[in-house]
Amino acid sequence: APEVSEEPRCPRAACQAKRGDQRCDRECNSPGCGWDGGDCSLSVGDPWRQCEALQCWRLFNNSRCDPACSSPACLYDNFDCHAGGRERTCNPVYEKYCADHFADGRCDQGCNTEECGWDGLDCASEVPALLARGVLVLTVLLPPEELLRSSADFLQRLSAILRTSLRFRLDAHGQAMVFPYHRPSPGSEPRARRELAPEVIGSVVMLEIDNRLCLQSPENDHCFPDAQSAADYLGALSAVERLDFPYPLRDVRGEPLEPPEPSVPGGGSGGGLNDIFEAQKIEWHEGGPPHHHHHH
């Protein structure tokens, strides 16, 4: 079992100055140094903050089952205790096919496994949705049109990593909630400089997690109960340099939302942020969208 000993304070004075500077500095990539102030963990402060066994971060990447670390709070020990040694990744022979046929409305049983992303729920139309709490917000360093061109591949790969089903959150008009992300000119810059057309450097993507098949599977103890725990897991993979996802992520987080209204098209959309997005026709800037906290 992992030792429950206090993590050392950040041993390097230089790390204080490097926190949050958009560079993952290897020597500062540790819990004591806050994963370089989030620079190495996709801006997740501490992916293991809920985990009481303090050494689980060390064991996360060891491909061995460490039972004391297999809880949701400890990020399921990177699924090392799951599937009894079964293949952890989608069979490479199927992977391209599964990405091309993800959520295309036709059930492909070869793709209907957690490691292949559950075929985008094409085989689960009769099963009611079971949405995790909140919405997973990713900032991806690809412009929206490029990201949407490869949306099936994007969702299939992310679903496979998280071992559950991901889909774009839809707005009140049934449109995927994928927004341009650009860096603003700092307020201190001269007015003329600030009026340069802001450069679109990525997309802010809002995703829902549908656990209907994850919770139905024989070992259903590894599903992410909320969007923040999924964000923590992605941050953890990034911190240990094991995030095999071909879309460059700037940051990830979970946003709490009020429960979806079933009358809105898309089933999982409506309420909460939608009206605000509609009113603002929002294009998010550095730091992302406003945080709206709702009590459940």
Epitope: D21, L141, P186, E241, R250
Partner: antibody, heavy 119, light 107 residues
Framework: QVKLLQSGAALVKPGASVKMSCKAS????????VTWVKQSHGKSLEWIGE????????NFNEKFKGKATLTVDKSTSTAYMELSRLTSEDSAIYYC????????????WGQGTLVTVSS | NIVMTQSPKSMSISVGDRVTMNCKAS??????IAWYQQKPGQSPKLLIY???NRYTGVPDRFTGGGYGTDFTLTINSMQAEDAAFYYC?????????FGSGTKLEIK
């Protein structure tokens, strides 16, 4: 559009120093790190180091610590690199580039500054 | 420090042929690789970032692939204007090392 304009070629004597500039335009200068890259004649590219115009923080290739000094002038959106104690090994083209956030790929490059060290 | 090793050092290819060049990292770097093209007398140009993403304006005959330690840049139909040096670069953690380059010539 994004542009990086570098200062002109320099012919310098061994043991002397040289300071070159890289003027950025078309984007918010303080939002992106500026990186410097060396290319000796007929050779590959070598990453020298980078500076954050926002904080002044720097990261260096160990090989260039003590050789290169990186500074910025935010008021003119200009980055500078000074090379000291020059030898013939320092004769090369030096490029400035803009490092993209978090990952540091280089989509924008200056035209290069040729430094020739000769007595 | 992670070393990036490119192979082959040079290749001579006919117009219309498919070309694949390699970049090997001495340790796992995930997807953190970029590819650049450099022609004589010019600054390098970004082709591929984060292993497989084509940069804006890059022709779709250029494809990047790989993960971990082994990466490839493929040109699926060589054009005369593709004759150049090609460099891979490690991203995300400093030092942001470049490979030694592959020289691609027209046969």
């Amino acid at each position: 559009q994004v542009k990086l304009l570098q200062s002109g070629a320099a012919l310098v004597k061994p043991g002397a120093s040289v300071k070159m500039s890289c003027k950025a335009s078309g984007y918010a200068f303080t939002d992106y790190w500026v990186t410097w890259v060396k290319q000796s004649h007929g050779k590959s590219l070598e990453w020298i180091g980078e500076i954050s115009p926002n904080s002044g923080g720097t990261n260096f290739n160990e090989k260039f610590k003590g050789k290169a000094t990186l500074t910025v002038d935010k008021s003119t959106s200009t980055a500078y690199m000074e090379l000291s104690r020059l030898t013939s090994e320092d004769s090369a083209i030096y490029y400035c580039t803009r490092g993209e956030i978090r990952y540091n790929w280089f989509a924008y490059w200056g035209q290069g500054t040729l430094v020739t060290v000769s007595s | 420090n992670i070393v990036m090793t490119q192979s082959p050092k040079s290749m001579s290819i006919s117009v219309g042929d498919r070309v694949t060049m390699n970049c090997k990292a001495s340790q796992n770097v995930g997807n953190n690789i970029a590819w650049y093209q450099q022609k004589p007398g010019q600054s390098p140009k970004l082709l591929i970032y984060y292993a497989s993403n084509r940069y804006t304006g890059v022709p779709d005959r250029f494809t990047g692939g790989g993960y971990g330690t082994d990466f490839t840049l493929t040109i699926n139909s060589m054009q005369a204007e593709d004759a150049a040096f090609y460099y891979c670069q490690r991203l995300y953690n400093s030092p942001f090392t470049f490979g030694s380059g592959t020289k691609l010539e027209i046969k």
